[in-house]
């Protein structure tokens, strides 16, 4: 029975050219995390495998950094980075848990005027 829940940073915004940390946290379960996949829509960005470490997609290697923890840091943000991101926790023995984050990358002038999403 899957008892765990995924907590995420929810809806977030960041400035173009800046960086952001995508963070998910699995709680309320004793399941062992075998691997976390980070995906943008249907594209695999990176994985963190408990036994084998981090692997970052070559397409994003220059702009994606592993961590902190099981999170993912996106750097040199562009407007095209706006969209949904998913953390997929493969656990034993529970199975798969998925968390969703929506990132909006704003032009720096807009961001300075506080047009930001509220994190729930």
């Amino acid at each position: 029975m899957m008892t765990g829940t995924i907590e995420t940073t929810g809806n977030i915004s960041a400035e173009k050219g800046g960086s952001i940390i995508l963070q998910c946290h699995l709680s309320s379960t004793t399941a062992q995390v075998t691997q976390v996949n980070w995906e943008q829509q249907d594209q695999l960005l990176a994985i963190c495998n408990a036994d084998l470490g981090w692997h970052i997609s070559p397409s994003f290697k220059d702009r994606v950094a592993p961590g902190p923890g099981l999170g993912l840091t996106l750097q040199s943000l562009t407007v095209n980075d706006t969209g949904e991101y998913f953390c997929i926790y493969h656990t034993y023995p529970d199975g798969t848990y998925t968390g969703r984050i929506f990132l909006e990358v704003l032009e720096s002038s807009v961001a300075e005027h506080g047009a930001r999403f509220q994190i729930p």
Partner: antibody, heavy 121, light 110 residues
Framework: EVQLLESGGGLVQPGGSLRLSCAAS????????MSWVRQAPGKGLEWVSA?????????YYADSVKGRFTISRDNSKNTLYLQMNSLRAEDTAVYYC?????????????WGQGTTVTVSS | QSVLTQPPSASGTPGQRVTISCSGV????????VSWYQQLPGTAPKLLIY???QRPSGVPDRFSGSKSGTSASLAISGLQSEDEADYYC???????????FGGGTKLTVL
């Protein structure tokens, strides 16, 4: 349809080399760990090697082949390779290419038909 | 010698239920999911069970898997002549940092 097709097997003398290939189709090749598994005549399955997703910068080997075999991948060609050097009689086997589950530790969900390697003088 | 231990052979008559065991240790079976593979004579292995007890599409529900502690088992009910094959269990071992298989069990349908 997900398919794996091995090639490159054959007869080779002890101490010789051989390069196996595995052409993949029907799935996003770069997003999966891939493995080689072998089966000696009349024997069971033996995992040989695996390679990480994406650029394949991490590789894993059974102790029996460490230092002699090299696994690699070319994502632009959807192809997995196994370079086998310093071959021994005990390397004689059918070699299978296998696609791993999204998580390597969860096993292999698709197998090729195999290619036969015979090491003999 | 294989890291996972399976009986070398098993047999049953058509319609019977047969169970094949697979024994390991904490660094493999206890900590990870177990898969089962079927190898019909002269063919490549095929995934039969993954995630301890999950069947891929196309695998009949006569095949079932289970796991408890450091052991796993494959049960085949309503045995049929076409089930005659070699069966292998497999899992990850985090001490070896390698995938490991059982030695295989040859199932004979009498």
């Amino acid at each position: 349809e997900v398919q794996l097709l091995e090639s490159g097997g054959g007869l080779v003398q002890p101490g010789g080399s051989l390069r196996l290939s595995c052409a993949a189709s029907g799935f996003t090749f770069s997003s999966y760990y891939m493995s080689w598994v072998r089966q000696a005549p009349g024997k069971g399955l033996e995992w040989v090697s695996a390679i990480s997703i994406f650029s394949g910068d991490s590789t894993y080997y059974a102790d029996s082949v460490k230092g002699r075999f090299t696994i690699s991948r070319d994502n632009s060609k959807n192809t997995l390779y196994l370079q086998m050097n310093s071959l021994r009689a005990e390397d004689t086997a059918v070699y299978y290419c296998a696609k791993s589950h999204t998580v390597l530790q969860y096993g292999m969900d698709v197998w090729g038909q195999g290619t036969t390697v015979t090491v003999s003088s | 010698q294989s890291v996972l231990t399976q009986p070398p052979s098993a047999s049953g008559t058509p319609g019977q239920r047969v169970t094949i065991s697979c024994s390991g240790v904490t660094s493999n079976i206890r900590n990870y999911y177990v898969s089962w593979y079927q190898q019909l004579p002269g063919t490549a292995p095929k995934l039969l069970i993954y995630g301890n007890d999950q069947r891929p599409s196309g695998v009949p529900d006569r095949f079932s898997g289970s796991k408890s502690g450091t052991s796993a088992s494959l049960a085949i009910s309503g045995l049929q002549s076409e089930d005659e094959a070699d069966y292998y269990c497999g899992t990850w071992d985090n001490t070896l940092n390698a995938w490991v298989f059982g030695g295989g069990t040859k199932l004979t349908v009498l």
